[in-house]
Amino acid sequence: ATKLTEEKYELKEGQTLDVKCDYTLEKFASSQKAWQIIRDGEMPKTLACTERPSKNSHPVQVGRIILEDYHDHGLLRVRMVNLQVEDSGLYQCVIYQPPKEPHMLFDRIRLVVTKGFSGTPGSNENSTQNVYKIPPTTTKALCPLYTSPRTVTQAPPKSTADVSTPDSEINLTNVTDIIRVPVFN
């Protein structure tokens, strides 16, 4: 079985987390998908989900979270705009497939939001506009209330150092490769 892995992102307040969750399009293209936060020792909590069935490239906004599902490409795009320090935590994408348990997608995202000036390499330091202008056609979707207890058999690790990965340790704060994380205020 594939081991659970994490990618760690360190962003500043006010910035946007912009990630993608990868799925098998033949199996899950129109399945309902959700973005969850996993708090230590608790059941995953669903923060936002796509419609049921999931609509192709149709943005769904719940508060500061925008989901966009690209069926042809097997990708769910997740944006969390105007990040706050309290948003720090471990997140995951899941696919709802009732009556079966939700199917977890890899990788989990370890988000660390810190206070301070958000101008970093890869960001546009002069930009004050919210570059994620959400079209008025966005929809709020109703998410299923159930959450799989099997996804919380143990508290998730507190840092990427505890995570077993298939190849090399993934921690965006200590890799030698150049990492381009698009960061827009």
């Epitope: 594939t2 990618e7 912009d18 990630v19 993608k20 969750c21 990868d22 799925y23 098998t24 399009l25 490239s57 690209y70 042809d72 490409h73 097997g74 990708l75 795009r77 944006r79 890899f106 990788d107 995202i109 890869g122 546009n124 930009s127 570059v131 994620y132 202008k133 298939p166 190849d167 090399s168 993934i170 965006l172 490769d177 150049i178 990492i179 381009r180 994380v181 698009p182 827009f184």
Partner: antibody, heavy 122, light 107 residues
Framework: QVQLVQSGAEVKKPGASVKVSCKAS????????INWVRQATGQGLEWMGR????????GYVQNFRGRVTMTRDTSISTAYMELSSLRSEDTAVYYC???????????????WGQGTLVTVSS | DIQMTQSPSSLSASVGDRVTITCQAS??????LNWYQQKPGKAPKLLIY???NLETGVPSRFSGSGSGTDFTFTISSLQPEDIATYNC?????????FGGGTKVEIK
């Protein structure tokens, strides 16, 4: 250093299939998407789709759905793009390109293969 | 799909000239725009990512700006080795799309 090395030129007959390989080195193969882009002679660049080497999941542009398959062999850090039911309009140079990390919404192609010319002719 | 319109399609300038290429998106793409240089018979090379960020090792005479739908790529002082075709590419929405390219020649 990061390198993507593609297989050599191919000449195919209409209706046949072609499989182009792209061997990656100098980085962790499973951490970055592999994308495929083609360019017909004198024409612009056309994105065909992407593959996540970690999961093996792939997605294709509508124009190519049903004809293209992107796969990988992680043991040799190699990605493959197979295009079937070839027609003369598929004559082009096919490039593999490294995209962003598998979990970031980033399609910045920072490293490219040298290109593989596929000629479709009867 | 998002259309990317590049202009001009070709231009001729003298060594040392300032060269400007524009790329217009058919809808708002935020700052999700990259610029590539392609020399004849070679693969494209990334010059600028996310509208204005210079790729490592790329000379500082290359720059980019813009936001939303209108983007500009500039070579502040054209050099003989800059003879190439330049392409913009958006990634705000899938499918990814490229501009038609701008061929830069020396007068």
């Amino acid at each position: 250093q990061v390198q993507l090395v593609q297989s050599g030129a191919e000449v195919k007959k209409p209706g046949a299939s072609v499989k182009v390989s792209c061997k990656a080195s100098g980085y962790t193969f499973t951490s970055y998407d592999i994308n495929w882009v083609r360019q017909a002679t004198g024409q612009g660049l056309e994105w065909m789709g992407r593959m996540n080497p970690k999961s093996g999941n792939a997605g294709y542009v509508q124009n190519f759905r049903g004809r293209v398959t992107m796969t990988r062999d992680t043991s040799i850090s190699t990605a493959y793009m197979e295009l079937s039911s070839l027609r003369s309009e598929d004559t082009a140079v096919y490039y593999c390109a490294r995209g962003g990390r598998t979990s970031i919404w980033s399609f910045v192609f920072d490293y490219w293969g040298q290109g593989t010319l596929v000629t479709v002719s009867s | 799909d998002i259309q990317m319109t590049q202009s001009p399609s070709s231009l001729s300038a003298s060594v040392g000239d300032r060269v400007t290429i524009t790329c217009q998106a058919s809808q708002d793409i935020s700052k999700h725009l990259n610029w590539y240089q392609q020399k004849p018979g070679k693969a494209p090379k990334l010059l600028i990512y996310d509208t204005s960020n210079l790729e490592t090792g790329v000379p500082s005479r290359f720059s980019g700006s813009g936001s939303g739908t209108d983007f500009t790529f500039t070579i502040s002082s054209l050099q003989p080795e800059d003879i190439a075709t330049y392409n913009c590419q958006q990634y705000d929405k899938l499918p990814l799309t490229f501009g038609g390219g701008t061929k830069v020649e020396i007068k």
